[in-house]
C-alpha cells in the first residue's frame, strides 16, 4: 500500500522559516504533488505549492521555494514574515496524486519538543485519504 | 473532501450524440480549470476539454466543433456535450479539478470516470 510521509523542521538562522519535505512511497507514477497548510488539500486547507513533474511548479506566498529532490519527494521552503508567517503549531499537508490510479495525502506539523534545525529523519506518516 | 461523480456515458451510434455531466462537490484552493480526460482501451490518458477559471474553453484538436464544454455555477456542474461522435471517441471520460500548467489542466481531483462506446 502506498504511504505518504511528511517532515517539518524550522530553520535554525530563521526562526520563521519553515522547510517541509514530503515523499512518497510506492511504485505508482507521481502526476501532482499539492502542499498545503492549516488542513489537507480540498478539506479547509491553502495551497502553498504545486508540483508537476513535467509541465513545471506553482508557488504562493509564503512558499519561496518549492522544488522536486527525486521522482518521489519535494521540498518547500516558507518564508514567514507577517500575518502570512507559520507558526509552530502549523500543520502542512502534502499530497501526491496518480491520474487516474488514486490520491494519497499526509499531514505533519513541526515536533512539539524540536529545537530549531533539529529534525528527526522523516517516517511514513498515516495515509489521510486515498481516492 | 472534493468529489466529483460523472454521469451521462454509454452506448451510442456513430454520429450520435451525448451529454456527460459531473456533479462536484468540495473545494480546493487556488485551483483555476476544470475539465475532461479521457483513457481509451489501451490508450494513454487525454486531455479533452478544460475551463480556465476566465471562463475560457479550451479543446484538444480532434473534438473541435463537435464537442462543447460548459459550467452551471449554480448547480456546481460541469458537462461536455459531444456530436457528431466516432468510434475513436470511445472511451472512459473523467472529469477533473486541477491547476493550470500553460494551456495544461493537471487534475488535481477527477471522479470514477463513465464509459462512452461509439459502435453501430
Known amino acids: 500500500t502506498p504511504e505518504v510521509w511528511v517532515q517539518v523542521r524550522m530553520e535554525a538562522t530563521e526562526l520563521s522559516s519553515f522547510t517541509i519535505r514530503c515523499g512518497f512511497l510506492g511504485s505508482g507514477s507521481i502526476s501532482l504533488v499539492t502542499v498545503s497548510w492549516g488542513g489537507p488539500n480540498g478539506a479547509g486547507g491553502t495551497t502553498l505549492a504545486v508540483l508537476h513533474p513535467e509541465r513545471g511548479i506553482r508557488q504562493w506566498a509564503p512558499a519561496r521555494q518549492a522544488r522536486w529532490e527525486t521522482q518521489s519527494s519535494i521540498s518547500l521552503i516558507l518564508e514567514g514574515s507577517g500575518a502570512s508567517s507559520p507558526c509552530a503549531n502549523t500543520t502542512f499537508c502534502c499530497k501526491f496524486a496518480s491520474f487516474p490510479e488514486g490520491s494519497w495525502e499526509a499531514c505533519g506539523s513541526l515536533p512539539p519538543s524540536s529545537d530549531p534545525g533539529l529534525s528527526a529523519p522523516p517516517t511514513p506518516a498515516p495515509i489521510l485519504r486515498a481516492d | 473532501e472534493v468529489q466529483l461523480v460523472e454521469s451521462g456515458g454509454g452506448l451510442v451510434q456513430p454520429g450520435g450524440s451525448l451529454r456527460l455531466s459531473c456533479a462536484a462537490s468540495?473545494?480546493?484552493?487556488?485551483?483555476?480549470?476544470m475539465g475532461w480526460f479521457r483513457q481509451a482501451p489501451g490508450k494513454g490518458l487525454e486531455g479533452v476539454a478544460h475551463?480556465?477559471?476566465?471562463?475560457?474553453?479550451r479543446y484538444v484538436e480532434s473534438v473541435k466543433g463537435r464537442f462543447t464544454i460548459s459550467q452551471d455555477h449554480a448547480k456546481n456542474s460541469l458537462y461536455l456535450q459531444m456530436n457528431s461522435l466516432r468510434a475513436e471517441d470511445t472511451a472512459v471520460y473523467y472529469c477533473?479539478?486541477?491547476?493550470?500548467?500553460?494551456?495544461?489542466?493537471?487534475?488535481?481531483?477527477w471522479g470514477q470516470g463513465t464509459m462512452v462506446t461509439v459502435s453501430s
Open positions: 475551463i480556465d477559471s476566465d471562463g475560457i474553453p
Open positions: 477533473v479539478v486541477g491547476f493550470k500548467f500553460g494551456d495544461y489542466c493537471a487534475p488535481n481531483d
Open positions: 468540495g473545494y480546493t484552493s487556488r485551483t483555476d480549470c
